[in-house]
Interface confidence: low
Amino acid sequence: MALPTARPLLGSCGTPALGSLLFLLFSLGWVQPSRTLAGETGQEAAPLDGVLANPPNISSLSPRQLLGFPCAEVSGLSTERVRELAVALAQKNVKLSTEQLRCLAHRLSEPPEDLDALPLDLLLFLNPDAFSGPQACTRFFSRITKANVDLLPRGAPERQRLLPAALACWGVRGSLLSEADVRALGGLACDLPGRFVAESAEVLLPRLVSCPGPLDQDQQEAARAALQGGGPPYGPPSTWSVSTMDALRGLLPVLGQPIIRSIPQGIVAAWRQRSSRDPSWRQPERTILRPRFRREVEKTACPSGKKAREIDESLIFYKKWELEACVDAALLATQMDRVNAIPFTYEQLDVLKHKLDELYPQGYPESVIQHLGYLFLKMSPEDIRKWNVTSLETLKALLEVNKGHEMSPQVATLIDRFVKGRGQLDKDTLDTLTAFYPGYLCSLSPEELSSVPPSSIWAVRPQDLDTCDPRQLDVLYPKARLAFQNMNGSEYFVKIQSFLGGAPTEDLKALSQQNVSMDLATFMKLRTDAVLPLTVAEVQKLLGPHVEGLKAEERHRPVRDWILRQRQDDLDTLGLGLQGGIPNGYLVLDLSMQEALSGTPCLLGPGPVLTVLALLLASTLA
């Protein structure tokens, strides 16, 4: 872009013309227009070619025309013209950058008389020593209190020289301040060192609450000590109310654990609940216009003094973006055990999870996993598949979090990872899993169950098998038989009982000789194909006194199918009135293929098999 040709701009001044004095350099970040000028109205700087062709005096230029100027151009102006420019900028309410203000201040070599006519923020860059008399300094610092001190960073030399000069001007001796002193200092009160906070807590703490920038370390420690001491204006933390918490807003991040623990829990809760719904707690929108990427970067920068040095309760007062910006992921990882004891909201936990995800993109190390606590509930099965969990303690810690709930996909994935890592379901693991999820064993496929070593069966309780189907019991029963093989009869039966749904006929026949008195509930869970070949005598011995229960179950499998296989005469010997057996004179043909399909034996009744009957009768008569 071509710069306009230099021309006389300021009349009879005789200084070199300022061809580009008011040229828009907004794109270079020179100017930050106020919201009213450029933010909401969408106003932009006007091209200056027309202005330069017919130069008016500075005060007649519009705000758009006054929007930007480089310092080099000002250095060629006389002090009088600089003052004129400064006054025009004040009148038009043009917001200047720090560089422009500093530049103008340097050119105003002697202390201006008409302070009120200058831009307020310009005063911050003037040397306070130039206003040494009592009246001059009072006038100067009265105006300063209305300026935006935070234009200057805390370390800036201009800002550092203001506070001592202001204290001297207001006649403050020592560290004891009155309410009037604090008021007179305005924004500079935020710079008062810790000794002032310690000695003047009653009047200074309420002012520090509204300081825009974070307090420095010295101030934080003094504020913390004053608040913990319980003196005025807030009193002991144990007596704080929700309105106290509201009043302390700006100081909440400096509260240490001892203070937070002293506040009644109900008060913290009520305050948090209210503040989470209070729109005034939202992050204020940035009002200064900047290129978009700058704003995003700023939002993620941690405000100074808020960097977390440890994971503690003070973090519950951090907004989500502050947690993101101020909590170091490595610190979080090393102090994960503390997270569980802090009542973070689920939204805050999301932020913490995000930090860990960034730190460990390939999956968390076990040292972190073991201490995840409630953060585990935020993990997806995809997250968990990246883990390598080998310690039973880690498994227990995470199962504890989900205790009392159905097995979630996360838990199922965790267990799967753990068992695969171990290669088999050993006794300790099974013990742990069934303690948390009694139905766990029955959620495994027969293939998965085949990896259970017989020694692990000792950990299984009857209720752990309640939901197992016959295919699963088919796998578990041989393992149980092996595990309990050295026990004596009655003890063996107690242990094997819940696995009998997988027992074959020959084992049931053997048990019937042991005088075991199987209950009906167990009998009803036996495999139908294993029960069918049992004789009435064998079933009677197997059930003992419980045999009477067969009557109540005669319509249900496997009792129904077993009855159909028995001779009615044999059933009648039980004296239970069981009906449906094979009548006398009927022949049972064991047509295995048909029985496999229908589940019932093939009975050849009168009609089709008269020949067979005739032969039968003949042999009977004979």
């Epitope: 109900g266 913290v268 809760a269 009542p343 909201t345 709930h405």
Partner: nanobody, 130 residues
Framework: QVRLVESGGGSVQAGGSLRLSCAAS???????????LGWFRQAPGKEREAVAR????????YYADSVKGRFTISQDNAKNTVYLQMNSLKPEDTAMYYC????????????????????WGQGTQVTVSS
């Protein structure tokens, strides 16, 4: 303004039963997606103890070991009331019983008993004599 009012306390012989109720005004149990309703008790000279809690979102309930199997917590959204049914009462159940609500907490905090209960009732006295 949230107000919780307990009722149903009184004196009873050991082995007897009582049903405590907690009615809320200025707040509707069902209007918050995440809250934890709890009954707490405090015997003279002892610390306040969480007796039972319910997380309506999931229907999960949590009990102190000392009352498991004897006490049951439940809620009636229509009546905006939470109940504590106390059976097989023992002399050691004697205490002031408080109803409390934690708004906006997760199920995890309800479960762990570490939930921040922001609203409390005035309490109702339960006395069990042997």
């Amino acid at each position: 303004q949230v107000r919780l009012v307990e009722s149903g306390g009184g004196s009873v012989q050991a082995g007897g039963s009582l049903r405590l109720s907690c009615a809320a005004s200025g707040y509707t149990y069902s209007s918050y997606s995440s809250n934890c309703l709890g009954w707490f008790r405090q015997a003279p000279g002892k610390e306040r103890e969480a007796v039972a809690r319910i997380y309506p979102n999931s229907g999960s309930t949590y009990y102190a070991d000392s009352v498991k199997g004897r006490f049951t917590i439940s809620q009636d959204n229509a009546k905006n009331t939470v109940y504590l049914q106390m059976n097989s009462l023992k002399p050691e159940d004697t205490a002031m019983y408080y109803c409390a609500v934690a708004v906006g907490v997760g199920d995890n905090w309800c479960a762990s008993g570490a939930a921040y209960f922001g609203y409390w009732g005035q309490g109702t006295q339960v006395t069990v004599s042997s």
